[in-house]
């Protein structure tokens, strides 16, 4: 988790002088509770937006938007703490909106936005907006939280973001797999425009089961420049095991931008259809 273009952060708007500050996620009002605290945010919305940095890189960002309730507690509102928690790592990042002037009611509902939390593809986050000061220990909560799921690099708009491109999202190997005679598979895929090696990982399974009955790894050396974007054809020999008929072929590239952590592509070959043969009817029925 990180912030985008830190020097560009602003939260001021007409009628409010405001500054964005780094936060430890532990506001002072936790330690020194106040008697009068503001009510919670209203209509918290989290959306996926896209941000180009100063240099021109493209990142997915969480666009956070909320409004204030139209009650007198805005007289005691000193700011807001925005917290983003990445659920699978428990990593948290916070910023604080610090109001440098008192809020007053005006003809429109107060509305705040922030679009500088960079998020990762295929990750889920919990976004919380806490109004400050935070409530006393037994006070009503004055925060709102929402979960936010970021699409993976297969998503058309995510594909061209810098983190996805770095993991090889623009490479479409267009894998084809065909079963040959004599227990062999022919795997064909399109090479990318980089002189890097690939690995084909073959895992075979019985018809209706998920534990593997055969595994094989095949190394493909780095192609020469004249082979870029060409098809690579590999024939894999399978183990002659009856019923070990469902094959998953996974291609792992080792691009310089992502090394061992590049996006993998896979294709699956299903077991051949069994003809529906009727159950044989016995000639006689035993009586015992």
């Amino acid at each position: 988790l990180r912030l985008l273009d830190h020097r560009a952060l602003v939260c001021s708007q007409p009628g409010l002088n405001c500054t964005v500050k780094n936060s430890t996620c532990l506001d002072d009002s936790w330690i020194h509770p106040r008697n009068l605290t503001p009510s919670s945010p209203k209509d918290l919305q989290i959306q996926l937006h896209f941000a180009h940095t100063q240099q021109g890189d493209l990142f997915p960002v969480a666009h956070i938007e909320w409004t204030l309730q139209t009650d007198a507690s805005i007289l005691y509102l000193e700011g807001a703490e925005l917290s983003v928690l990445q659920l699978n790592t428990n990593e948290r990042l916070c910023v604080r909106f610090e109001f440098l002037s008192k809020l007053r009611h005006h003809h429109r509902r107060w509305r705040f936005t922030f679009s500088h939390f960079v998020v990762d593809p295929d990750q889920e986050y919990e976004v919380t907006v806490h109004h400050l000061p935070k409530p006393i220990p037994d006070g009503d909560p004055n925060h709102q939280s929402k979960n936010f799921l970021v699409p993976d690099c297969e998503h058309a708009r995510m594909k061209v973001t810098t983190p996805c491109m770095s993991s090889g999202s623009l490479w479409d190997p267009n894998i084809t797999v065909e079963t040959l005679e004599a227990h062999q598979l022919r795997v064909s895929f399109t090479l990318w425009n980089e002189s890097t090696h690939y690995q084909i990982l073959l895992t075979s399974f019985p018809h209706m089961e998920n534990h593997s009955c055969f595994e094989h790894m095949h190394h493909i050396p780095a192609p020469r420049p004249e082979e870029f974007h060409q098809r690579s054809n590999v024939t894999l020999t399978l183990r002659n095991l009856k019923g070990c008929c469902r094959h998953q072929v996974q291609i792992q590239p080792f691009f310089s931008s992502c090394l061992n952590d590049c996006l993998r592509h896979s294709a699956t070959v299903s077991c051949p259809e069994m003809p529906d043969t009727p159950e044989p009817i016995p000639d006689y029925m035993p009586l015992w």
């Epitope: 273009d5 937006h49 896209f50 941000a51 180009h52 940095t53 100063q54 021109g56 890189d57």
Partner: nanobody, 125 residues
Framework: QVQLQESGGGLVQPGGSLRLSCAAS????????MNWVRQAPGKGLEWVSN????????FYADSVKGRFTISRDNARNTLYLQLNSLRTEDTAMYYC??????????????????KGQGTQVTVSS
């Protein structure tokens, strides 16, 4: 101070072409990614295209992909946008914008650093 001056707009028939230019001054041009944004009559700002600092990477909104081409000349401190196969829906005021920019899934601009005064492009028969 930062100055961005667009030029090259005009009236053109559907299917026609234009080349927009943006002369930049008051900052180190080659240190910043640059953008083109546009605003159709009665609409908000829409992001159109971006180019990174050395011109090696370009991005386009879906509606202009394959028709518009962004480029830059760092020696001349100038940003360009080549508009081909123009459609009536491309009618808008076109602005160049410096540095960071944020937009939503529909390319509506939500934050923008600095933009010029704009040049009008009208596509009509």
């Amino acid at each position: 101070q930062v100055q961005l001056q667009e030029s090259g707009g005009g009236l053109v028939q559907p299917g026609g072409s234009l080349r927009l230019s943006c002369a930049a001054s008051g900052f180190i041009f080659s240190n910043y990614g640059m953008n083109w944004v546009r605003q159709a009559p009665g609409k908000g700002l829409e992001w159109v295209s971006n180019i990174n600092i050395d011109g090696s990477r370009t991005f386009y909104a879906d509606s202009v992909k394959g028709r518009f081409t962004i480029s830059r000349d760092n020696a001349r401190n100038t940003l360009y946008l080549q508009l081909n196969s123009l459609r009536t829906e491309d009618t808008a005021m076109y602005y160049c914008a410096k540095g960071s920019i944020t937009y939503d899934m529909d390319y509506r601009v939500t934050t923008i650093e600095e933009k010029g005064q704009g040049t009008q492009v009208t596509v009509s028969s």
